[in-house]
């Protein structure tokens, strides 16, 4: 419960604080959890234990591990634990997902980007600001305290932000990078009632007997993000799980976002195996939200083999 | 075996609200649609809405939205349907209803009367 | 909307008599139609779903049949318990219609 993930870059700074939490008057104790050794509070070491701080100035692959810190008042202990991972310096732009931290939402009106965990450095302005690894310039842009403020934000502008900073210890001075995703919030979205868009209303759908089949159930529900939208397949007028036929499943499809704004959802509806009796079911792709529900109806009709002459 | 018990009648003035429960027992709560129905008297049967007890999403018929809000208890697998702003043309008997296949209503609440008299 | 349009709006028959009752929606529906009888006083009563499928519990004597937009109930050999008002509801599309019923009278 008392654990706490933090993350760094070889060769750059990398600050810790114990998860317990305490007066400042208590001590802390810092172990390496493996060997059960004590980390020392010497500022000379690289790393070092500071109260409730631990740093790596600078961190190293091998400084990876649990550090268990112990906080020690007149009547108790309490121990937390920081899992520590170092990463190599990654050659190219991309920053993986184990790097990143949480995403962060904007919108027309707001859009603060904090710089993560950079409270437990001592760093001083100007911070910088990198958006996938471009240097960020411009007057839409400024780099205010701890956070970057963008003016008049569009949907271009989600992305992964890196703030870089240096942070200073008795003159020396350490680099420290973070990122986060920034996400943007559509203000002017609306929903409306369900519109499927696949498969066209009392379709047939040709299939092979004993092949595999696919029906996909598309509908769109407005712009921006939908509140209790969902899409889903009906078989004789039952639930698909309902229906218990384990040839027959369905699977969730891709979250769409059109170009136009419009948000979608597919569900795909898969038949193993094709058997006669399928063509005797009524498949129905089910499209609710808040305003009503509709459906559209699908049959499947035999495909006839077609000869193949050279 | 399934059961869908309702509150009792009310008389109410216009302008008021009323809020009709339906507990339902017999059955997993959470597995199906219930519906709203009503009929005023001498009347045929119209279609309020429905309420998802998993999910708590409603969809109600355009000429009660904004005055009909469903809720869900799960705790007590109760549903409740709520008209505000009643008038004298909203006197009729409330039904809840159980979803089954196709979405027709296979198990009915007894009914309760709410009566909107000045 | 979907409209629903049962005809006719009443009847006369006797014991033993055949009865069709007609339901036409203003859009196909496919088979999502279901009937229901109802007594006065008392709450519907489910008899066919999906428009041809009878309900557990419910007598031989009623059926359904139909697909798309016109729909019919059926009762072979009408009993002194089925003397009720008949509804057809669609469920394809929000909001789920009724018919304005038909009343099955003793003649």
């Known amino acids: 419960k008392f654990s706490k993930q933090s993350w760094g870059l070889e060769n750059e700074a990398l600050i810790v604080r114990c998860p317990r939490q305490g007066k400042p008057s208590y001590t802390v104790d810092w172990y390496y959890s493996q060997t059960n050794k004590s980390i020392p509070t010497q500022e000379r070491n690289r790393v070092f234990a500071s109260g409730q701080l631990l740093k790596f100035l600078p961190a190293a692959v091998a400084d990876s591990g649990i550090y268990t810190c112990i906080v020690r008042s007149p009547t108790f202990n309490r121990t937390g634990y920081a899992n520590v991972t170092i990463y190599k310096k990654q050659s190219d732009c991309n920053v993986p997902d184990y790097l990143m931290y949480s995403t962060v939402s904007g919108s027309e009106k707001n859009s603060k980007i904090y710089c993560p965990t950079i409270d437990l450095y001592n760093w001083t302005a100007p911070l910088e600001w990198f958006k996938n690894c471009q240097a960020l310039q411009g007057s839409r842009y400024r780099a205010h305290k701890s956070f970057l403020v963008i003016d008049n934000v569009m949907t271009e502008d989600a992305g992964d932000y890196t703030c870089k900073f240096i942070h200073n210890e008795n003159g020396a001075n350490y680099s420290v990078t973070a990122t986060r995703s920034f996400t943007v919030k559509d203000e002017q979205g609306f929903s409306l009632f369900p519109v499927i868009g696949a498969p066209a209303q009392n379709e047939i759908k040709e299939v092979e007997i004993g092949k595999n089949a696919n029906l996909t159930c598309s509908a769109c529900f407005g712009k921006g993000t939908q509140f209790l939208a969902a899409v889903l397949w009906q078989l004789n007028g039952t639930k698909i799980t309902d229906f218990g036929e384990p040839r027959i499943q369905q699977e969730e499809g891709q979250n769409q976002s059109f170009s136009n704004g419009l948000a979608c959802l597919d569900m795909v509806l898969r038949i193993a195996d094709v058997k006669e009796e399928d063509l005797l079911l009524q498949y129905d792709c089910l499209a609710l939200n808040l305003h009503g529900l509709r459906r559209h109806t699908v049959r499947l009709s035999r495909k006839n083999p077609i000869d193949h002459h050279s | 075996q399934v059961q869908l018990v309702q509150s009792g009648a009310e008389v109410k003035k216009p302008g008021a609200s009323v809020k009709v429960s339906c507990k339902a027992s017999?059955?997993?709560?959470?597995?199906?649609?219930m519906f709203w129905v009503r009929q005023a008297p001498g009347q045929g049967l119209e279609w309020v809405g429905l309420?998802?007890?998993?999910?708590?999403?409603?969809i109600f018929a355009q000429k009660f939205q904004g005055r009909v809000t469903m809720t869900r208890d799960t705790s007590t697998s109760t549903v409740y349907m709520e008209l505000s702003s009643l008038r004298s043309e909203d006197t009729a008997v409330y039904y809840c209803?159980?979803?089954?296949?196709?979405?027709?209503?296979?198990?009915w609440g007894q009914g309760t009367l709410v009566t909107v008299s000045s | 909307d979907i409209q629903m349009t049962q005809s006719p709006s009443s009847l006369s028959a006797s014991v033993g008599d055949r009865v069709t009752i007609t339901c036409r929606a203003s859009?196909?529906?496919?088979?999502?139609l279901a009937w229901y009888q109802q007594k006065p006083g008392k709450a519907p009563k489910l008899l066919i779903y999906g428009a041809s499928s009878l309900q557990s519990g419910v007598p031989s004597r009623f059926s359904g049949s139909g697909s798309g937009t016109d729909f019919t109930l059926t009762i072979s050999s009408l009993q002194p318990e089925d003397f009720a008002t008949y509804y057809c509801?669609?469920?394809?599309?929000?909001?789920?219609?009724f018919g304005q019923g038909t009343k099955v009278e003793i003649k």
């Open positions: 017999g059955y997993t709560f959470t597995d199906s649609f």
């Open positions: 209803a159980r979803s089954s296949d196709y979405d027709s209503s296979d198990y």
């Open positions: 859009q196909s529906i496919s088979t999502w």
């Open positions: 509801q669609q469920s394809y599309n929000s909001p789920y219609t």
């Open positions: 309420i998802n007890p998993g999910t708590g999403a409603t």
